[in-house]
Interface confidence: low
Amino acid sequence: IVLRPPRVHNSEENTMRALTLKDILNGTFSYKTFFPNWISGQEYLHQSADNNIVLYNIETGQSYTILSNRTMKSVNASNYGLSPDRQFVYLESDYSKLWRYSYTATYYIYDLSNGEFVRGNELPRPIQYLCWSPVGSKLAYVYQNNIYLKQRPGDPPFQITFNGRENKIFNGIPDWVYEEEMLATKYALWWSPNGKFLAYAEFNDTDIPVIAYSYYGDEQYPRTINIPYPKAGAKNPFVRIFIIDTTYPAYVGPQEVPVPAMIASSDYYFSWLTWVTDERVCLQWLKRVQNVSVLSICDFREDWQTWDCPKTQEHIEESRTGWAGGFFVSTPVFSYDAISYYKIFSDKDGYKHIHYIKDTVENAIQITSGKWEAINIFRVTQDSLFYSSNEFEDYPGRRNIYRISIGSYPPSKKCVTCHLRKERCQYYTASFSDYAKYYALVCYGPGIPISTLHDGRTDQEIKILEENKELENALKNIQLPKEEIKKLEVDEITLWYKMILPPQFDRSKKYPLLIQVYGGPCSQSVRSVFAVNWISYLASKEGMVIALVDGRGTAFQGDKLLYAVYRKLGVYEVEDQITAVRKFIEMGFIDEKRIAIWGWSYGGYVSSLALASGTGLFKCGIAVAPVSSWEYYASVYTERFMGLPTKDDNLEHYKNSTVMARAEYFRNVDYLLIHGTADDNVHFQNSAQIAKALVNAQVDFQAMWYSDQNHGLSGLSTNHLYTHMTHFLKQCFSLSD
């Protein structure tokens, strides 16, 4: 099944050219998406090409600039945020990246009523996080790990927390592990719907072991970066949740929200907070052994000014076959009665589906069902529920948007996107205005991405927001590779794969094969999305076949496949890549003497283990920033899938699943090991230990480090990396330069 639709081809074939590495490194064929910044049911903001902030009204058709590019430029602003009362805008500048989501910045407040910046009681700098209240123009911000509140932008700040300390106590922002592995945000504070209350997390990292690595910089002496980072089995952060009344913040101060007794009895995590109303909040907690999650609904007690979380409002979600949830435990979407909610979790057949919980989880009403999975609940209105799934035509790597009418019985289901642009668009996400009056659909492929605006009642398309015309024109004279998504049936397991084939692919010829692998738990590589990237170039210009395979442990195909890797990382993921390669060889067009594998992060771990599998299938391979032992990686992630590295738990498999244990097996492959020295995520330690083991085994290998680069190897390092990897592969495959 060829997924990439045919393009408008130039009549003269000889004007077509292959992709170059330079095209990829320059981002020549990158695409744009359009996500409206909704500010009401029918209005949104968008930053124009010339950097004016423009307000659009869908119903009147009007648009006007609320903030000029001149004002933006006056403080070198790279981002903005309009207060809900539309009186002020914060302007963000001096962006300084920290970890995956976190950054610090300088903030200026611009008064739209008088066209001037607010003077007096200016915000300190740099600020770690800042946000408006959902109503009015209160500001909450985090500075030096403490939370501050302003009733109005020009007011003096009210200090909410006082115990914040760098690398010790984090208020309103997550520590490293919560940011990366639990919350996936830069913030840990949440306004109630009307801004009456502000909830926040306090993370105590006092007893967490610290990862320390050198940052070389330009000075005579390197500096040391210290991050409290709990590796598998280590002491974890201690979390507490507080809520403060922002109208009268000084009365009782922050009030702690109690932890459910069944959770508090041993190590635990806080996983998310969802406000239901101004006086009802929902917290989700997770045992350290992450197969039990508790959702706790808490109510404000006016008489005591405290938060009460009755046991009758605790809902337990437990997995008997793996960990709780998918990558994360799903979050609830509350209905208008402010007590019942919709949530995605495994049904009795082991597929993740939407359930409606009114009183107890046991009495949950299943809303969707089938041998496919519901992936995200976008919005619940009084009469509709919008969600995405991979149901359509049984392709796990697709995403379509559905609407279920919940106002009628039985509920009727409609696929909003399935037939809109069927060839071009099979992978969607959506963004809804207030009350789902309007929504934007963003299609990621397999054709050129397109963003459109729709009426929330009728689903009718109103206009195209972005169709990437320039990209379409630029690609007209490019020989793009062909792509196909198919499946292999092996021993009761379905292995979906994506194959990227050279433009002039001929089944009767033999081609070198490169396997690109990630393979981490709850990941998905085989997706119907558009991309012109490094592997597109390798197929287009260098004539390689590239394959991506979703094996056991990957997501959205049911719990049997997902939880197969539970407590056994590094086994089945590798086996399934090898199985797929054998099947590809059987197809007849693969040169079995020229097969390589490469991956990054978890993919680096899998590629390393595949190379060291002793099968003789792979001639060479690359591992970028690989995990080499699960004892070196973060507790929250690792223990979710592996349990604890203790004798009475799973220490044996922790030891058996290291790359170092297989050092001897690298003797007959060409191995390129790559890592950034300032990788805060998968520490350089991982590659250092692989290198040491290979040296000790007297095994030859190639290596490249990137000084002061993190897990993303960005900037100039990216160019160097892909150039270096290209040379390595071409040499491995005996392709001339």
């Epitope: 003096p156 700040p157 115990n163 009030q255 000014q305």
Partner: antibody, heavy 123, light 107 residues
Framework: QLQLQESGPGLVKPSETLSLTCTVS??????????WAWIRQPPGKGLEFIGN???????YYNPSLKSRVTISVDTSKNQFSLKLSSVTAADTAVYYC???????????????WGQGTLVTVSS | DIQMTQSPSSLSASVGDRVTITCRAS??????LNWYQQKPGKAPKLLIY???SLQSGVPSRFSGSGSGTDFTLTISSLQPEDFATYYC?????????FGQGTKVEIK
């Protein structure tokens, strides 16, 4: 160093209104991240919280006194005031102004106090 | 309102004695409890906050413990300047309330 000083008449007749002012020095009422409180202590008895005010004028009063209490703030003079109407002999007490402090554990305490002023309700 | 009950209401002790004062809350107040010392004609002075944290400048002979409903203030070795009245105060819910006081007198 923050200092608080209560001032006002030491004698008030029954049914009249007790009025006290607290002058803050060593810190600005409006630039501080704190709130300002009144607490009283009848002779030989324990302490009773009356109410508090934020620099913006937001107030909270002890429900037991709410109907009779008004606390106001004058940021230009760096002062806040207490009015207690319809007083009786039971309102005879030492009246303290105080500034509570609190931090991330959800706890707060009264860290700064005035020296107190005795108000007697008697005809 | 949360009632705070101190015991004893008064006690006699000698210099060097170990003195313990208890405070009981009418409902659980977690660790949201503070202790004050008051001398005649003076304003109260903060000793302990958050049940067990010593306010800076307060001698280490003062210590606090407890959580939930039962709390204790301990003076490990009574000094002449410690003869005073001691109050507990909860900040768990509004309004903040104080105990009735414990008077420590010279034996």
């Amino acid at each position: 160093q923050l200092q608080l000083q209560e001032s006002g008449p030491g004698l008030v007749k029954p049914s009249e209104t007790l009025s006290l002012t607290c002058t803050v020095s060593g810190g600005s009422i409006s630039s501080s991240s704190y709130f300002w409180a009144w607490i009283r202590q009848p002779p030989g008895k324990g302490l009773e919280f009356i109410g508090n005010i934020y620099y913006s004028g937001s107030t909270y009063y002890n429900p037991s006194l709410k109907s009779r209490v008004t606390i106001s703030v004058d940021t230009s003079k760096n002062q806040f005031s207490l009015k207690l109407s319809s007083v009786t002999a039971a309102d005879t007490a030492v009246y303290y102004c105080a500034r509570p402090s609190y931090y991330g554990s959800g706890n707060y305490y009264f860290a700064f106090w005035g020296q107190g002023t005795l108000v007697t309700v008697s005809s | 309102d949360i009632q705070m009950t101190q015991s004893p209401s008064s006690l006699s002790a000698s210099v060097g004695d170990r003195v313990t004062i208890t405070c009981r809350a009418s409902q659980s107040i977690s660790s949201y409890l503070n202790w004050y010392q008051q001398k005649p004609g003076k304003a109260p002075k903060l000793l302990i906050y958050a049940a067990s944290s010593l306010q800076s400048g307060v001698p280490s002979r003062f210590s606090g413990s407890g959580s939930g409903t039962d709390f204790t203030l301990t003076i490990s070795s009574l000094q002449p300047e410690d003869f005073a009245t001691y109050y507990c105060q909860q900040s768990y819910s509004t309004p903040p309330t104080f105990g009735q006081g414990t008077k420590v007198e010279i034996k």
